[in-house]
Amino acid sequence: AVNGTSQFTCFYNSRANISCVWSQDGALQDTSCQVHAWPDRRRWNQTCELLPVSQASWACNLILGAPDSQKLTTVDIVTLRVLCREGVRWRVMAIQDFKPFENLRLMAPISLQVVHVETHRCNISWEISQASHYFERHLEFEARTLSPGHTWEEAPLLTLKQKQEWICLETLTPDTQYEFQVRVKPLQGEFTTWSPWSQPLAFRTKPAALGKDT
C-alpha cells in the first residue's frame, strides 16, 4: 500500500453485521487486507477479509453472530482497523472508534407483496429485516414506482414518516406493468443512511372494464 487519499466507512445493520468499505488511491489490488473489530465492552473480536469491489476500494462484512441477535447497543464503541499484509507483518492502514447506533444502515426491506390490485390502485406490503427492537416505531420509509418508459432515477419518491409497512399507490394507469421498491431508515444516528432499495416487485394493474369510462 502507498500513501494516497484513504477512506474507511462502516455501517451497522442494527443487529449482527457491520459492513465496511475501504478505499485507498494507489493501493495495490493484490494486497491482502482485513478489517478487525475490537469492542470496548465485549469479550469477542471479529475479522473479515477485504475483497476488491473496484479499482481502489475493498469491502467486507463483519458477521457478529446469528442474523437476528442483538450484538451491540447504543453505548458500545467498536475500534475498527484496516490491516494490510506487508511482507511478514500486518500494518494498520486506517482506524476509527465506531459508534454503531450513530452509523446505521438497515438491510433492504423484504417480502414485498401485492395485497390488492385494481385498475387505478395497488396496495403493497413489505417487512423489515434484521432491524433492532430498540427502534420500536422510530423508522421511516421511502418508496418509488417505476412507470413504463421511465427510469428509477426519474421516479418520484414517496415518503412515509412513520413505521408503516404498506402503501396504497393511486392514480395508476389500467392494464399497465409497474415495478415498486422501498427502503428504510432509522431516525437515530448522526451518520445513519438509507438501506439499499428492496428487490423490485413487479405488478400489473387490472384492465378497465369494457364499456366503462376510465
Epitope: N3, W38, T79, R81, R91, I95, Q96
Partner: nanobody, 126 residues
Framework: QVQLVESGGGLVQAGGSLRLSCAAS????????MGWFRQAPGKEREFVAA????????TYGDSVKGRFTISTNNAKTTVYLQMNSLKPDDTAVYSC???????????????????WGQGTQVTVSS
C-alpha cells in the same frame, strides 16, 4: 522510513516533573499520529498518550490522565510529553512511536505504530 529520537529522561523524585521530547525525521509527511508508550521491567508495553499531527486530538492512558500532557511543536516534527506529579509506578523506559494509519481512536495499541524510537529511561524515586 521515519527516525525517532527521544530525550529528556532521567532520575526524579516522586511528585516531580520531567519533559520528554521526541524528534522525528525522514518521511514524516506520511505520519498522522505520534504517541508515547512505556515499559517497566517485567511488564507489557503500555500506552501513555497520543496526539494527531494536526494537534487537534489527544488521548491518554488511564494511569496518566490529568498528570501527563502531550503536545507538538509548530512544525509538527517534535512531540513532547510533559509529566507532572510523577510516582514511582511511572518508572519505565518511555518510547516514542509514529503511525501512518488514517483516522483516530482513543484505544491505541502497539500494532497501530510503524516506527519506534530507542526509548529513554525515566526513574522516579520515592
Amino acid at each position: 522510513q521515519v527516525q525517532l529520537v527521544e530525550s529528556g529522561g532521567g532520575l526524579v523524585q516522586a511528585g516531580g516533573s520531567l519533559r520528554l521530547s521526541c524528534a522525528a525525521s525522514g518521511s514524516i509527511f506520511s505520519l498522522n499520529t505520534m504517541g508515547w508508550f512505556r515499559q517497566a521491567p517485567g511488564k507489557e508495553r503500555e500506552f501513555v498518550a497520543a496526539i494527531s499531527r494536526s494537534g487537534g486530538s489527544a488521548t491518554y492512558g488511564d494511569s496518566v490522565k490529568g498528570r501527563f500532557t502531550i503536545s507538538t511543536n509548530n512544525a509538527k516534527t517534535t512531540v513532547y510529553l510533559q509529566m507532572n506529579s510523577l510516582k514511582p509506578d511511572d518508572t519505565a523506559v518511555y518510547s516514542c512511536a509514529a503511525s501512518a494509519a488514517v483516522g483516530w481512536t482513543t484505544r491505541w495499541s502497539t500494532i497501530d505504530f510503524d516506527s519506534w524510537g530507542q526509548g529513554t529511561q525515566v526513574t522516579v524515586s520515592s
